[in-house]
Interface confidence: medium
């Protein structure tokens, strides 16, 4: 069953997803989609990374985290009730049927009546994180040079509170941890 995350209308939602490359610096393609993870790829893709950088994004969807910690958590800006639903984070590990798929359920609550917008920590008790940024996607993305082959040993999503400000100091302490290879 999906892990549930909450946000309020008008605020930013945070959907956690992490992976740990076998060797630092080895990026794995990741896609985020609206709807449960299908057999292949992501349906209704909202953001995609390749081995070098983000290569596709749509307005309001982006990554705010620290790649050094394998953080590919999705931020959805200025959510509406229509943003409720299942989201798929898919870590696209090379090889046939090697992908790791995580379905996360986002529940949007009507906004509380407040005189002015405030910074909020209202996602879940497990993820008390402040997100109040603006913007509409990177004006340009750039290509990095070649990276070594990818060989993942561990894929993680977060289901408990992470223990440091980088959100992923020790991924072994996070929720589901899958080791491969």
């Amino acid at each position: 069953s999906e892990v549930e995350y909450r946000a309020e209308v008008g605020q930013n939602a945070y959907l956690p997803c992490f992976y740990t490359p076998a060797a630092p610096g080895n990026l794995v393609p990741v896609c985020w989609g609206k709807g449960a993870c299908p057999v292949f790829e992501c349906g209704n893709v909202v953001l995609r990374t390749d081995e070098r950088d983000v290569n596709y994004w749509t307005s309001r969807y982006w990554l705010n985290g620290d790649f050094r910690k394998g953080d590919v958590s999705l931020t959805i800006e200025n959510v509406t009730l229509a943003d409720s639903g299942i989201y798929c984070c898919r870590i696209q590990i090379p090889g046939i049927m090697n992908d790791e798929k995580f379905n996360l359920k986002l529940v949007i609550k009507p906004a509380k009546v407040t005189p002015a917008p405030t910074r909020q920590r209202d996602f879940t008790a497990a993820f008390p994180r402040m997100l109040t940024t603006r913007g509409h996607g990177p004006a340009e993305t750039q290509t990095l040079g070649s990276l070594p082959d990818i060989n993942l040993t561990q894929i993680s999503t977060l289901a408990n509170e992470l223990r440091d400000s980088r959100l992923a100091n020790d991924l072994r302490d996070s929720g589901a941890t899958i080791r491969i290879g």
Partner: antibody, heavy 123, light 109 residues
Framework: EVKLLESGGGLVQPGGSLKLSCAAS????????MSWVRQAPGKGLEWIGE????????NYTPSLKDKFLISRDNAKNTLYLQMSKVRSEDTALYYC????????????????WGQGTLVTVSA | QAVVTQESALTTSPGETVTLTCRSS?????????ANWVQEKPDHLFTGLIG???NRAPGVPARFSGSLIGDKAALTITGAQTEDEAIYFC?????????FGGGTKLTVL
Amino acid sequence: EVKLLESGGGLVQPGGSLKLSCAASGFDFSRYWMSWVRQAPGKGLEWIGEINPDSSTINYTPSLKDKFLISRDNAKNTLYLQMSKVRSEDTALYYCARPNGYYVGTIFPFAYWGQGTLVTVSA
Amino acid sequence: QAVVTQESALTTSPGETVTLTCRSSTGAVTTSNYANWVQEKPDHLFTGLIGGTNNRAPGVPARFSGSLIGDKAALTITGAQTEDEAIYFCALWYSNHWVFGGGTKLTVL
């Protein structure tokens, strides 16, 4: 074209405070990690710290974290460095730097640099 | 705090290959240190060359390459040119902060 323009430097007395700014243009500032780096006269580079896009994560070099404060205003496309309790050894050119790529920015933070602003600490 | 050490100065000739290195006081440099290389030209003009050990920035000539050699990070210039004369700084990541080396003054003559 990526442009970073530092300002706010000048002469400050020991023990005083100063706030530096870095105005960014030519890219979507709100998507990028940003760093401050300094260079004392005739010396090498010293990393001061970095801030992530929504200000939820800020890292400092251990020796400076109690006297410097990094912040940003994404609406103004501006990065800030608040300096306090300055001493003569804080005399330096102060630079802001932007990464290459916003997703992998944390592993390549020093791709683009401003021209620097000079801070002189003297009585 | 870790200390990052570079050669203070190196001299090469146009067309030659030269390698600058970056050593960590804490032990071998690994990919987890995400070595960066920055070039300083006269008038304090800085340009990032390499990040994440081996990734070239856009517009950086292919003659610049980053790698790990033994227990050190390395910047190799294959076929050095006169315009490559500059100071080169490396920076290494240590869990929650970056540390720069003292820089290598490269002379091309």
